[in-house]
Interface confidence: medium
């Protein structure tokens, strides 16, 4: 039997002010997923219990949308959202599987350039 592993979208990028979908998938049908945690560094963003539903951490309620499926959507991105995100799958009987996604939030690409004219 093939060992279970987490497949993620890897490195993703998005524009400031836009949104990003964080996606992880457990490539196994032989282990029971009971809960998926989404973390940013050491901060818990959201928990998806397979039967008891989604729990979004209060600090992120305005900017985190559950789904699609076990994925997580981040809204109103700022450059401060750049960094590592982790999905942690709690499974039985295997235990914990962890996946990593790196999100790069690019600053607005519209820059104002002033051109100076020299009056003779």
């Amino acid at each position: 039997t093939m060992a279970s592993m987490i497949v993620t979208t890897g490195n993703i990028s998005a524009e400031e002010g836009g949104s990003a979908i964080l996606q992880c998938h457990l490539s196994s049908t032989t282990t029971e997923v009971t809960q998926v945690n989404w973390e940013q560094q050491d901060r818990l963003l959201a928990v998806r219990h397979v039967d008891l539903g989604w729990h979004i951490s209060p600090a992120f309620k305005e900017r985190v949308v559950p789904g699609p499926s076990l994925s997580l959507t981040l809204l109103a991105l700022t450059v401060n959202d750049t960094g590592e995100y982790f999905c942690t799958y709690h499974t039985y009987p295997d235990g914990i599987y962890k996946g990593r996604i790196f999100l790069e939030v690019r600053g607005s690409s519209v820059a104002e350039h002033s051109i100076g004219f020299q009056i003779p």
Partner: antibody, heavy 116, light 110 residues
Framework: QVQLQESGPGLVKPSETLSLTCTVS????????MSWIRQPPGKGLEWIGI?????NTYYANWAKGRVTISKSSNQVSLKLSSVTAADTAVYYC????????????WGQGTLVTVSS | DIQMTQSPSSLSASVGDRVTITCQAS??????LAWYQQKPGKAPKLLIY???TLASGVPSRFSGSGSGTDFTLTISSLQPEDFATYYC????????????FGQGTKVEIK
């Protein structure tokens, strides 16, 4: 105000099924998690299981296969089969238990003795 | 499975003492931890939830701290009514768990 009250027989014979009911008032079970906990005499708290607002249940590893938690409009029921003397305990129901604001409140508890 | 380990299992203290009880989770439970006080013959009473939030009506001498795997309950100045048994409880996982509670810490009069 929010209140929970456990009820059921205080004496159960070995190998029989223990059946308890938790009657709630002051809140809705349709939007609450409910937990069952027990405490053998002179020992610590033992989690039995939880029922979600949607009716899904999760049981402690030691209780799987022996325990059933269910609910109706204002009652949560606990059934524990094939009891032995080791199941003698005070049984509590409590609101909450999974990613909530703690288990609060608790019922006053009911002592169940398993003896022939 | 997550195991919750409390220490010490018992302690003796005097009125006015500062008392600290620790609880360690076998894996990360973030801030999903509650503390309870239980007196003989009574149901447990919620003291702290989400690791550090004081439950309604609980005196401010009680405080909770920690996140991840290590948590602390502190009683800043022990009062006569505080002699009791204290339990921690993880609220992070309910699937495939043996017990969500720590084994308890009994606070006795010195």
């Amino acid at each position: 105000q929010v209140q929970l009250q456990e009820s059921g027989p205080g004496l159960v014979k070995p190998s029989e099924t223990l059946s308890l009911t938790c009657t709630v008032s002051g809140f809705s079970l349709s939007s609450s998690y409910m937990s069952w906990i027990r405490q053998p005499p002179g020992k610590g708290l033992e989690w039995i299981g939880i029922i979600g607002s949607n009716g899904n249940t999760y049981y402690a590893n030691w209780a799987k296969g022996r325990v059933t938690i269910s609910k109706s409009s204002n009652q949560v029921s606990l059934k524990l089969s094939s009891v032995t003397a080791a199941d003698t305990a005070v049984y509590y129901c409590a609101r909450g238990g999974y990613r909530t604001s703690g288990m609060d409140p608790w019922g006053q508890g009911t002592l169940v003795t398993v003896s022939s | 499975d997550i195991q919750m380990t409390q220490s010490p299992s018992s302690l003796s203290a005097s009125v006015g003492d500062r008392v600290t009880i620790t609880c360690q989770a076998s894996q990360n439970i973030y801030s999903d931890l509650a503390w309870y006080q239980q007196k003989p013959g009574k149901a447990p009473k919620l003291l702290i939830y989400r690791a550090s939030t004081l439950a309604s009506g609980v005196p401010s001498r009680f405080s909770g701290s920690g996140s991840g795997t290590d948590f602390t309950l502190t009683i800043s100045s022990l009062q006569p009514e505080d002699f009791a048994t204290y339990y921690c409880q993880q609220e992070h996982l309910v699937a495939w768990i043996y017990n969500v509670f720590g084994q308890g810490t009994k606070v006795e009069i010195k």
